[in-house]
Interface confidence: medium
Amino acid sequence: LPKAPVITTPLETVDALVEEVATFMCAVESYPQPEISWTRNKILIKLFDTRYSIRENGQLLTILSVEDSDDGIYCCTANNGVGGAVESCGALQVKMKPKITRPPINVKIIEGLKAVLPCTTMGNPKPSVSWIKGDSPLRENSRTAVLESGSLRIHNVQKEDAGQYRCVAKNSLGTAYSKVVKLEVEVFARILRAPESHNVTFGSFVTLHCTATGIPVPTITWIENGNAVSSGSIQESVKDRVIDSRLQLFITKPGLYTCIATNKHGEKFSTAKAAATVSIAEWSKPQKDNKGYCAQYRGEVCNAVLAKDALVFLNTSYADPEEAQELLVHTAWNELKVVSPLCRPAAEALLCNHVFQECSPGVVPTPIPICREYCLAVKELFCAKEWLAMEEKTHRGLYRSEMHLLSVPECSKLPSMHWDPTACARLPHLDYNKENPKTFPPMTSSKPSVDIPNLPSSSSSSFSVSPTYSMT
């Protein structure tokens, strides 16, 4: 007799691990034999889908290799035309060992900001996520929390938060560990010890001291009156992320010295500054005509001509007096290569002593011009022929301004050593010395004996630079 279908074994919930086999059984009694169809989440499973096997006249559904997307409600429906169709449903729960789908990455963060180390996981049952710092489990506190997503959030990052981190995902089926990542905490440059201001006497040595810290360790640069320090010696040491810089200066002029500590954070820099003034006791502004200061000669061209450690006048009408005056002698010096062997050393001595005049420090640094007699000795004794030629060329305007040659000095404008022996500078190597004779013969008493002259210069500037050439 015909009999309507009855499902004798209703579907049950099935648990299955990924890549395992899962089977649903739907035993049906009926006559005639029913047609059995299967659905997943109300979508018909096609008989020819190779991921499934349907056997025993449709009563057994096998998923051959479970994927996590197979999760859902499976129903079987039996119908044989007698009575209504019958249905039974059961769930497939795909069980999954923990898997870290978005692992943490190395992070560099500036102290005080918020850091988030990601750790997104998959798994069934849902894994719990914890974190390890170094070798120990990380304890959550007011600044540190593991978010619902598994990520680690650290508010107001501190230096002590730096270190190695890994996340751990755990469920009943297993445990997964991320790779170890590094949290680096960078700290803005900060000055721990600022340089102190000093009031010193002219020509004394001063050491300015500046200490800074930061991560990475900052570099320290010194600025003098807005420009990089060009003189002085700098000593630096680094210990425990603290950099200590000492600038030793030979003081010949007042100045504002700034210590700048800088470190880099990615493409950006952080900077901290501290300044100190160095003033000179009884220092007054130089007179209008003599704008400049005294300093030891540190150049190259004249150091065989000028006295060792000579104090010379540097003219601040140039942006960079040392550089400008050195360039001046350099160019003129090369022109002297063609003069006679008798003239050349005398002219070199005159050149160097003119451009780098002896300097009287005093209250107002003052250049000391060369004595007229020495200038005349070069002009009329050693370099008479060359001097004449040079005067002629100068008057005819044959010297190009680019050559910035010195024009012919007017010896008559220089002070005489007979007026005031301290008011003008002698050229010692032009003086004949009987015990140590140089290449030049002694002169008559009307003129000083001369040996290796240099070029003079005074506030009345008997030598002048071609005005069209700018040294600044």
Epitope: S230, E300, E326, H330, T331, E402, M403, S470
Partner: antibody, heavy 121, light 112 residues
Framework: ELQLVESGGGLVQPGGSLRLSCAAS????????MSWVRQAPGKGLEWVSA????????YYKESVKGRFTISRDNAKKTLYLQMNSLKSEDTAVYYC??????????????WGQGTLVTVSS | QAVVTQEPSLSVSPGGTVTLTCGLS?????????PDWYQQTPGQAPRALIY???SRLSGVPSRFSGSFSGNKAALTITGAQPEDEADYYC????????????FGGGTKLTVL
């Protein structure tokens, strides 16, 4: 005749050292500044270092500071370049050149033929 | 650090005039940079042509001259010869303590 002859180049491994020499003749060596200039294969000229007539100061391109040392022996009329901690980017022909005056700068008015330095592992 | 800029390549007909320039990536070239010009032919060491803007070295033909053009230094070859085909480098002095001497990238001059 003025001559500058470089020597001391060759193949060296990264991190290694070489000392280049430049023998000068035909001019008053101790009255002129000197320089080293290099040229990487197929590239332009690059100033490396300079020294004035008396060796009283030295100047270097930023990238070689602390690794290279320029010096001179006026008695031997020889310029030197001691190169330490060499890197592959130091591979070049190294020219010795005479400055136009005593100072460490000024036009390079005479050049040697160069010596090849190859830094490679 | 400022970069010294030059035209990568230029060409000139024999007998023609060509001007090569030398600038700074930031700012102008001034007389305080003492522009120098060098010529280098393949396989040879460089040779100085002009120093301090416009002073010709001895033995350099008068067709080579130096000057300023706007905010750049310039090398002009008047009446170019086939033997002038070469690489030309300008170099600038970057003074104030460091005394750096910086070469430009060079200009390849072709005499067609």
């Amino acid at each position: 005749e003025l001559q500058l002859v470089e020597s001391g180049g060759g193949l060296v491994q990264p991190g290694g050292s070489l000392r280049l020499s430049c023998a000068a003749s035909g001019f008053t060596f101790d009255d002129y500044g000197m320089s080293w200039v290099r040229q990487a294969p197929g590239k332009g000229l690059e100033w490396v270092s300079a020294i004035p007539w008396n060796g009283g100061s030295t100047y270097y391109k930023e990238s070689v500071k602390g690794r290279f040392t320029i010096s001179r022996d006026n008695a031997k009329k020889t310029l030197y370049l001691q190169m330490n901690s060499l890197k592959s980017e130091d591979t070049a022909v190294y020219y010795c050149a005479k400055r136009s005056g005593r100072i460490a700068f000024g036009a390079l008015d005479a050049w040697g033929q160069g010596t090849l330095v190859t830094v490679s592992s | 650090q400022a970069v010294v800029t030059q035209e990568p390549s230029l060409s000139v007909s024999p007998g023609g005039t060509v001007t090569l320039t030398c600038g700074l990536s930031s700012g102008s070239v001034t007389s305080s940079n003492y522009p120098d010009w060098y010529q280098q032919t393949p396989g040879q060491a460089p040779r100085a042509l002009i120093y301090s803007t416009n002073s010709r070295l001895s033995g350099v033909p008068s067709r080579f001259s130096g000057s300023f053009s706007g905010n750049k230094a310039a090398l002009t070859i008047t009446g170019a010869q086939p033997e002038d085909e070469a690489d030309y480098y300008c170099a600038l002095y970057m003074g104030s303590g460091s005394r750096n001497y910086v070469f430009g990238g060079g200009t390849k001059l072709t005499v067609l």
